[in-house]
């Protein structure tokens, strides 16, 4: 039988290249059993992680997987940076690995590439 510990499965050292002006959903996969924990997002600023109080978030339940989503509608150039999700569960604070967004400002690009083109160009 699976343990009922809360776990946050943001992939270690994960990175996402995204375009300013596009919508984007940053996913925090959350494993829990009976009671859904309270989850928050923060953005790293040096060694501290600043809680994102005023951002749109939501839960998504999909094929027995739960996600706590941070919405970027749209992505802005200053969304560039590293993010972490945290869960409060039975008085314990559980922190995820950080995930980094690399934002390309399309204003400076002469021709707007497709998402898939940009991803392959950015990461290849």
């Amino acid at each position: 039988k699976e343990s009922c510990d809360v776990q946050l499965y943001i992939k270690r050292q994960s990175e996402h290249s995204i375009l300013a002006g596009d919508p984007f959903e940053l996913e925090c996969p959350v494993k829990y059993c009976a009671n859904r924990p309270h989850v928050t997002w923060c953005k790293l600023n040096g060694t501290t992680c600043v809680k994102l109080e005023d951002r749109q978030t939501s839960w998504k339940e999909e094929k027995n997987i739960s996600f706590f989503i941070l919405h970027f509608e749209p992505v802005l150039p200053n969304d560039n940076g590293s993010y972490r999700c945290s869960a409060n569960f039975q008085s314990n604070l559980i922190e995820s690995h950080s995930t980094t967004l690399y934002v390309t400002d399309v204003e400076s690009a002469s021709e707007r590439p497709s998402k898939d083109e940009m991803a392959s160009r950015f990461w290849a």
Partner: antibody, heavy 118, light 111 residues
């Protein structure tokens, strides 16, 4: 039911480029992580890399200068390209999906066997 | 890279007996708060098949004869009792750290 199917050449000449396709049904490649793995004739399994739900990629550093992984979301396919192949790249190539809760490979393709030979 | 050392490399077990396969990691596998160590079975001509995920969780549809245990650097796959259909090569895999790595495999045969 999630299904993955690899396709591509069975024979490639040294120094050429290998291109493989993984066609996915039963799930969208805009969720989870989609991987390439290969198995050498001596039975060693090597992890090659992934493309994520957002389109970002990770490559095994041992292959980084030669590999790219791309996708076509409208076809629900992702692709492996391996440049400058040698006989050492002779292997069976698998595509597989990683589960979000721990990244284990819960669905695999049947594999496609590649021989690199002149 | 995290190196996974499997032992033994091959194993011959009588039907109905217990088979135990060990996987030792060169670094601790626990950065997610649990152990991202998994076990696969591969039969000739087939892709690997997930048996155990996150050290001790039995994949859906896999018989309860298969079990996994361990933490940190030492992990074990146990098959009890062994059946004729279990003839295969078994691999451990870690997904705690990139690049993911596999053990060298353990070939199980019937004595």
């Amino acid at each position: 039911e999630v299904q993955l199917q690899e396709s591509g050449p069975s024979l490639v000449k040294p120094s050429q480029t290998l291109s493989l396709t993984c066609s996915v049904t039963g799930d969208s490649i805009t969720s989870a992580y989609w991987n390439w793995i290969r198995k050498f004739p001596g039975n060693k399994l090597e992890y090659m890399g992934y493309i994520s739900y957002s389109g970002s990629t990770y490559f095994n550093p041992s292959l980084k200068s030669r590999i790219s992984i791309t996708r076509n979301t409208s076809k629900n396919q992702y692709y492996l390209q391996l440049n400058s192949v040698t006989t050492e790249d002779t292997a069976t190539y698998y595509c597989a999906r990683s589960h979000y809760y721990g990244y284990y490979f819960d669905y695999w393709g049947h594999g496609t066997t590649l021989t690199v030979s002149s | 890279d995290i190196v996974l050392t499997q032992s033994p490399a091959s194993l011959a077990v009588s039907l109905g007996q217990r088979a135990t396969i060990s996987c030792r990691a060169s670094e601790t596998i626990d950065s997610y708060g649990d152990s991202l160590m998994h076990w696969y079975q591969q039969k000739a001509g087939q892709p690997p098949k997930l048996l155990i995920y996150r050290a001790s969780n039995l994949e859906s549809g896999i018989p309860a004869r298969f079990s996994g245990s361990g933490s940190r650097t030492d992990f074990t796959l146990t098959i009890n009792p062994v059946e004729a259909d279990d003839v295969a090569t078994y691999y451990c895999q870690q997904t705690d750290e990139d690049p993911y790595t596999f053990g060298g495999g353990t070939k199980l045969e019937i004595k």
